[in-house]
Structure formats: C-alpha cells, structure tokens
C-alpha cells in the first residue's frame, strides 16, 4: 500500500523498482496531480483490508444546507509514499485534496515525525476552485538533503473542528557510511590483546566494516557493523583505520595510533636547589613516560669519599612534583645523586649523576666542665668551660653562646651572649639579686649552633651575702647539675 | 566444534577436470573466508589464494590465477575447488582453511589427494 | 611477495630438549603464524599473531619476534611434537610459507 520512489540512474518502469510498488526516479518533483490536469491516481487498497479502496484519515461532512444529499467523505489524495534520493539532492512532494467550495478558511498544515513544521520551510499551498469543488495541492520542497531530513513527512487539514490527515511520505536520504562510533588511540602493553570499535550507519544499509593495521587489511571478509576487532597483541606502535562499505561507496574513519607502553626514559637536568649541612633539595626534568603514567621516584644518594663504603642510600618519592629533599645527610660531604623514575611497566634507567655538597654542620656536642661562680664582687657571675671536641663535618669553631635565666619571685628572664672562639671563660653582669641564674653554653660553628650544655645554677643572695662556691657540671653519670651557694 | 570435511581422493587423466568441494560445519559459513592450499608430493604449503564467503567473490594468487575457479553453494555451507586442463604437475594434496582476520588459517579440511597421471 | 626462510630445514633432537626454530621474512611483516603438520595429516594451528597460542596447544610451544625475525620455541620436546613446521606471514598478500622445518627424533 506504499509506493515508492527510488533515485536511479537508470531507465525503468513507473511503478516496478526494485521492492513490489516501488519507484525508482531520479525526479526531483513528485507530484500528485489534481485531477482537472487528466491524470487519474491509481486506486490504492489498505495493506489490512485487501480490496477495500484505503481512504486514510477522512472527515465525513455534514448534509448539504439543502439537507438532500451527503458530499463524499473528504481525503487527501495517495501519492507516493516512499522517495529514496541520495545526500545533497532537491526534493519536492505533495498532498492533495478537494474540498467542497461550502468549506471556508482551509489551511494545510506540514509534519515531520509528529511535530509541525513551521518557519523556514518551502511549503506552497495552491488552490484550484471549481464550481462545486477547490482542488487543493500543498506542496513542500527541500534543497540538498541531509540525513537529518530523513522521516515520515504528513500534511494535516482542519474543517468544521475535524482533522483529515494525508498519508505519510516517508523521505529516506540515502548516502555515504556516516561513523557513530570510530576507534580510538590507545596505550597498550606489548604483546597484549586489546579492542578497537567501530560502529557507522546508512543508509542504505547494510554497512560492511573491514580493519585495516598499517596500510593491510585485517579482515578481508567484511563484518556487519557495529565490529569489534580483538588485535591480538603488537609489539610496535601501528596505526589502525575502519573503512565502513554500503552500496553508495566508502567511508573512512580517521587513522588512530596505538602505542606499546615501555618503560621510561631517564630523567634529565638534575639539579641541586638548596644544599644545607644535612639536607639537599633537587629537582629533576622527567623523561618520556614510555605511553604509561609515572607512578613513583627513586632519588639515589652514593657519598663521594675514599673511605665510604660505596653503599647507596635509595629514596623513594612521588612523581610529581619533580622535587625531592634528600635528607640524613653527613654535613660538610661530597655526594653522587641520579634520579629514575617508573611507570607500570618497570624503572628507567638513571640520570646522569651529578655532584652535591652538603654545607658545614653544627656541632654536635657541647663544651664541657662547665663552672660558675660569683666574683668577689657580686656584680658578675664568672662562667668558665672547656672547648668540645667537635668533628671535622661540624666545621671550624666561631665562638660559643651563652643562655642565662634569671628566676626571682615569679619573675624570668632569658639572656643571650656570644662570645669568640679562642674564649673558655666569661663574665656576666648580675642581672637580680635573690634569685637563681641558669647557665648554658653552645658551640657555634658557620653550620649552626650545637647543643647546649646541661644547665648549671647558681643562687645570688641578696645584698651583704658573701659566697664564692662554684657550681659546676656535674662529673659524666650524675644524675642533676649540683648548685653550690 | 568447527568442522572441515572435503570430498575424497581423485585420480584424473591429463586434460581433464577435477572439482574438490569443501563442506563447513558448526559455524557461520558466511561469516568466514574459505582459502585454498596446496602440497605437492614431498612439498611445503603453498596458498592459492580465498573466496569471500559473504559476496561469493573469488580471489587468486598469481600463480593459480589460470585454471583453478573457487566457488560456493552456501546453502550447504560447501566451497568448491575446480581445476581444469589438469596437468602432472597438478598432483598434489589441497586443502581447504577457514580464512580468519591476520590471515590466520584456524581450521582446516583433511585433504584432498588429487593424482593426474595418464 | 615476501619470502620465507626457515632455519634449520631439518633438525634431530630428544625428548625432554628445548628447540627453536628461526623464520626469516625478507622484508618486514606484521604478524607470524605457526603451524605444525604430522605426516598424511592437515596442517594444525599451533601459533597465531606471532605469540599467541591457539586453541588446545600445550603451554611448552612459545613464539616471539617481530619486523623480519621470529622464533619458535619448544620447550622440553615431548614424543608426539616431532612433526613439520611451518612459519606464514601476515601483512603482505599474497600470504607466503616458509619451507618447513622437519623436526626428528635423535
């Protein structure tokens, strides 16, 4: 029950074509005529009742005002239901219908897939009155077709609150495979197995996918699309392309790379950023990731010196940033650092190591046999020590600094003093009376200050006391500095 | 499972013609190409070339491009090998082979021993 | 077309000893199938794609390779492996075979 019209180059029959009641034409004008032009359509019967002539969507009209006879049920015309033309072409269709002259203001309406189509859109309606009857023919046109005209086109006619609808005309723009879906580049591992996709649409279907792998043909059966190729491992990058077939030609999907993860390559331009006595910050430029995210570092440390063991110290960090703080360090030493990096297929090799120094250190013990004692003349605390014995990483002796506090009857007070290197004695000034000073001392090296001493106490009494006890360290085991007053 | 079954041994005259035929069974017999490979006495393999099972489409290396013709009766899954003009040196054992992607020969019929001797 | 080359063409070996055989292309190919072939029988898949085990074929047989030099390998030769093999390369029609290679008891 539809007719159809199919775009092709060759001559043929009016209605044969290829499917039974279909025409195929490469007119862009197919029209259903009004009759006065002499042209009779031919009489279509309903798919669902053979033999019955199919009226589609009909109004019956009211009697006539003299009330003697019934006007024969409205309907739009058949015309041809199915027009078949290739991307890019004209197309122009029609409905008709006759509508008795006592009917007033008939207007057709256009619809594509049950929504109306308004604006934009080449519809002509003409009328051709006769006495009785007005031949009405809306014809609608498009231009160089596209798949998205693609659909079930239907005119509709409102008279007396009742609505006539025509047949549908189905537009099938027919073209090149269009992708839906194409493959993409991928990171594989080698030697693994993995998927690639393609999906492409008509019509004209069916579309046939053949795979093509750097330039040769994977399948030289095609397969019916969507296809899924399982590429069953590769051990170089290749380049993978689709083509998708359908009886207008061929399409072809973009070339896409597929890459075979490795491990990485070394990083580059390691560089020393901060260097302090225990500590060295560097950085690093990462090399290629080898098609597989960096997961972690390994900053490796050797001590540049004759009498090391040449052990490597290993520490490992994060990828990014691509900063690390080596720490643990021996101050005043030579190193050797290199930097490798990984990803899941394994470790780069190492950068090209580089020299670091780390700078003085502080020292590491305090000076000893500290002794204070009040002078004579109540007015200084006399502080005297002896020198520590530091280690060559600590560097050369600048001098020592002096810690002494000052607790009275809820009061405390911290003081500083520096004094030279060559120095083992000092005097401090009495700051209160009738309290306690707490001494210490530290050696400071260009490194830094070590640690201070155990703390050494010393009462000053007030005014008229006479006391010249020293307090001192107290001898290496005991348990607390002794104050002697 | 995937089954190869070709017809029986054939001893023909020279001149004369000789038509293998290939029955495919447990699987989409269009969904495969079916290629042709041929082992002379004492020899090693040698492909002839395929036919797409799809399109009926046959294709020949150059070598067997004269006298030899592929064809199909998909309605019973059959390929058929027809040589023509038969000479000695025809004489060989062919097989046919379920033609997969990479050009894999996955499966394959038992042989077909094809004597020409007059 | 691309030539196959398989070294050796014959070779005698035990049961227990692992064996490998070299196929050679003349220029570069894509991937390299393996095929075994017992004598009176069909040739039987053993390898696909260079490295890939086809169905049923015990874990001992292994290849590898790439561009024009690949390898098959059988490790710890059992009694029913002594057969003919054959390399055939994919990446160039028309596909080609190597020659063979004859593999015997010792």
């Known amino acids: 029950a539809i007719t159809e019209a199919r775009e092709e180059a060759k001559p043929y029959p009016l209605f044969p074509g290829p499917l039974p009641g279909s025409l195929q034409t490469d007119h862009t004008s197919l029209l259903s005529l009004p009759h006065t032009s002499g042209y009779q359509p031919a009489l279509m019967f309903s798919p669902t009742q053979p033999g019955r002539p199919y009226t589609g969507n009909v109004a019956i009209p009211r009697v006539t005002s003299a009330g003697s006879k019934l006007l024969p049920p409205l309907a739009f015309k058949h015309t041809v239901g199915h027009i078949i033309l290739s991307e890019h072409k004209d197309v122009k269709f029609n409905c008709s219908i006759s509508v008795p002259n006592i009917y007033q203001d008939t207007t057709i309406s256009w619809w594509k897939d049950g929504k109306e189509l308004l604006g934009a859109h080449h519809a002509i309606t003409q009328f051709y009155p006769d006495d009785e009857v007005t031949a009405i023919i809306a014809s609608f046109s498009i231009t160089s077709v596209q798949r998205s005209d693609n659909g079930s086109y239907i005119c509709k006619m409102k008279i007396n609150n009742e609505e006539i609808v025509s047949d549908p005309i189905y537009i099938e723009v027919q073209g090149l495979p269009h992708f839906t879906k194409q493959p993409e580049s991928m990171n594989v591992t080698r030697n693994t197995a993995f998927n690639l996709t393609c999906q492409a649409v008509g019509p004209p279907e069916p579309v046939n996918i053949f795979w093509v792998q750097n330039s040769s043909r994977v399948n030289e059966q095609p397969e019916k699309s969507p296809s899924v190729l399982t590429v069953p491992g590769l051990t170089e990058m290749a380049v993978f392309s689709c083509e998708a077939h359908n009886d207008k030609g061929l399409t072809v999907s973009k070339g896409v790379q597929i890459n075979i993860k490795a491990i990485p390559s070394p990083p580059t331009e390691v560089s020393i950023h901060n260097s302090t006595a225990h500590s060295i910050l560097i950085s690093w430029v990462p090399g290629f990731d080898g098609y597989s995210p960096f997961r972690n570092c390994s900053v490796q440390v050797k001590e540049v010196d004759p009498l090391s063991n040449g052990s490597v110290m290993i520490f490992n960090t994060s990828a990014s940033p691509h900063m690390y703080q080596i720490k643990q360090l021996q101050a005043l030493a030579n190193y050797s650092i290199g930097v490798s990096c990984m990803n899941e297929i394994g470790w780069s090799a190492v950068s090209p190591w580089i020299l670091a120094s780390t700078t003085e250190g502080a020292p590491s013990v305090a000076p000893l046999n500290v002794t204070v004692f009040l002078n004579e003349s109540r007015d200084n605390v006399d502080i005297r020590w002896m020198k520590p014995l530091t280690k060559r990483q600590a560097g050369e002796l600048v001098g020592y600094r002096i810690s002494h506090v000052w607790q009275s009857a809820g009061i405390s007070k911290e003081l500083l003093e520096e004094v030279g290197q060559n120095n083992s004695r000092a005097q401090i000034s009495v700051q209160v009376h009738n309290a306690t000073c707490t001494v210490r001392i530290a050696a400071v090296t260009k490194g830094g200050v070590g640690p201070f001493s155990d703390p050494v106490k010393i009462f000053i009494p007030a005014h008229g006391w006479v006391d010249h006890a020293p307090s001192s360290t107290p001898a290496p085991g005991n348990a607390d500095p002794v104050l002697i007053i | 499972q995937v089954q190869l079954v070709q017809s029986g041994s054939e001893l023909k005259k020279p001149g004369a013609s000789v038509k293998v035929s290939c029955k495919a069974s447990?699987?989409?017999?269009?969904?495969?190409?079916m290629s042709w490979v041929r082992q002379a006495p004492g020899q090693g393999l040698e492909w002839m070339g395929w036919?797409?099972?799809?399109?009926?489409?046959?294709s020949y290396t150059d070598d067997f491009k004269a006298r030899f013709v592929f064809s199909l009766d998909t309605s019973v899954s059959t390929a058929y090998l027809q040589i023509s003009s038969l000479k000695a040196e025809d004489t060989a054992v062919y097989y046919c082979?379920?033609?997969?992607?990479?050009?894999?020969?996955?499966?394959w019929g038992q042989g077909t021993l094809v004597t020409v001797s007059s | 077309d691309i030539q196959l080359t398989q070294s050796p063409s014959f070779l005698s070996a035990s049961v227990g000893d692992r064996v490998t055989i070299t196929c050679r292309a003349s220029?570069?190919?894509?991937?390299m199938h393996w095929y075994q072939q017992k004598p009176g029988k069909a040739p039987k898949l053993l390898i696909y794609a260079t490295s890939n085990l086809a169905q049923g074929v015990p874990s001992r047989f292994s290849g590898s390779g790439s561009g024009t030099e690949f390898t098959l390998t059988i490790f710890s030769l059992q009694p029913e492996d002594f057969a003919t093999y054959y390399c055939q390369q994919w990446g160039s029609l028309p596909f080609t075979f190597g020659q063979g290679t004859k593999l015997e008891i010792k």
């Open positions: 447990s699987y989409t017999f269009t969904t495969y190409g």
């Open positions: 036919i797409n099972t799809y399109s009926g489409v046959p």
């Open positions: 082979a379920r033609y997969t992607n990479y050009g894999v020969f996955d499966y």
């Open positions: 220029s570069s190919v894509g991937y």
